[in-house]
Interface confidence: medium
């Protein structure tokens, strides 16, 4: 599924991202456009051997298990392909252990490059939540 | 017990088309990566590219790009490849493999003539 | 992409002989290196994983070793259904890649 921004924004509302360990919605809407264009089907390979998955492009060496990345960690205790789904519960909840790991949000580099530092709030302007 | 099961034997003309299957049981098919291998004689292994069922995700071998497209069917558990423009050059055994990294799972093989 | 190299391409020997068989890749690849076994008219049979793990099943005889570019595949006293062709293939990067493969014959 391809999100609209304030689908999404409303999506990772009900999921309770909303100021999440401090960091408001925009943040996370600005890193899931970022990160896969909204879209939960996204999958990118990385030069590690590891794969991102999904609308926050969580990565299979430590969050998921995919089945074949070395020494995967798995820390979020799901297969890769649930991040896939058009419901994002896996994924938020993915992220909200990701997001208290330690680095916050730094952990997703599209965030760092893209929205850290930015007006984030102009990702859920004009969206009814 | 996992298991990938292809479709038979095809005898083609050049310039046709032709859909193999691989149809999987024995483990839950939208969660693991699908690969397919092409190999001909005196040409080894060549790996030509893969697909998440649960997704659609497709990555290809540069090689393969235009010849080959994949495709999977959640509700019948089957992965499928085409293959268009047939030539002489496409006669070869394909495989399916549960895409671990390495593979532990294969199919039987289909056997393609072009002929 | 990686290339995998494969030597001796053909390697003859006698039931009860210890062989190594090499495989050497274009660039590092970690110890993300597969060993298979393949028979006449049969599918791939994955022996070892990640360079030096034998699979369930596979007679303790196969070993593997090696890291980085270059990874031996050792069989301790070969059997005679140990003939057949042997390939090597790498996880490390897409695209995945086998060597040219090995071919285990009875001298």
């Known amino acids: 599924k391809v999100f609209g921004r304030c689908e999404l924004a409303a999506a990772m509302k009900r999921h309770g991202l909303d100021n999440y360990r401090g960091y408001s919605l925009g943040n996370w809407v600005c890193a899931a456009k970022f990160e896969s264009n909204f879209n939960t089907q996204a999958t990118n390979r990385n030069t590690d051997g590891s794969t991102d998955y999904g609308i926050l492009q969580i990565n299979s060496r430590w969050w998921c298990n995919d089945g074949r990345t070395p020494g995967s960690r798995n820390l979020c205790n799901i297969p890769c392909s649930a991040l896939l789904s058009s419901d994002i519960t896996a994924s938020v909840n993915c992220a909200k252990k990701i997001v208290s790991d330690g680095n916050g949000m730094n952990a997703w580099v599209a965030w760092r490059n893209r929205c850290k530092g930015t007006d984030v709030q102009a990702w859920i302007r004009g969206c009814r939540l | 017990q996992v298991q990938l099961q292809e479709s038979g034997a095809e005898v083609m003309k050049p310039g046709a088309s032709v859909k193999i299957s691989c149809k999987a049981t024995?483990?839950?098919?939208?969660?693991?990566?699908i690969e397919w291998v092409k190999q001909r004689p005196g040409h080894g292994l060549e790996w030509i590219g893969e697909?998440?069922?649960?997704?659609?995700?497709?990555y290809y071998n540069e090689k393969f790009k235009g010849k080959a497209t994949f495709t999977a069917d959640t509700s019948s558990n089957t992965a499928y490849m085409q293959l268009s423009s047939l030539t002489s050059e496409d006669s070869a055994v394909y495989y399916c493999?549960?895409?671990?990294?390495?593979?532990?799972?294969w199919g039987q093989g289909t056997t393609l003539t072009v002929s | 992409d990686i290339e995998l190299t494969q030597s001796p391409a053909t390697l003859s020997v006698t039931p009860g002989d210890s062989v190594s068989l090499s495989c050497r890749a274009s660039?590092?690849?970690?110890?993300?290196l597969h060993w298979y076994q393949q028979k006449p008219h049969e599918s791939p049979r994955l022996l070892i994983k990640?360079?030096?793990q034998s699979m369930s099943g596979i007679p303790s005889r196969f070993s593997g070793s090696g890291s980085g570019t270059d990874f031996t595949l050792s069989i301790n006293s070969v059997e005679t259904e140990d003939f057949g062709m042997y390939f090597c293939?790498?996880?490390?990067?897409?695209?995945?890649?086998f060597g040219g493969g090995t071919k285990l014959e009875i001298k």
């Open positions: 493999a549960r895409g671990d990294g390495n593979y532990y799972y």
């Open positions: 024995g483990y839950t098919f939208t969660t693991y990566w």
């Open positions: 697909i998440l069922p649960g997704s659609g995700s497709t």
């Open positions: 660039q590092s690849i970690s110890n993300n």
């Open positions: 990640y360079t030096s």
């Open positions: 293939q790498q996880s490390n990067s897409w695209p995945r890649t």
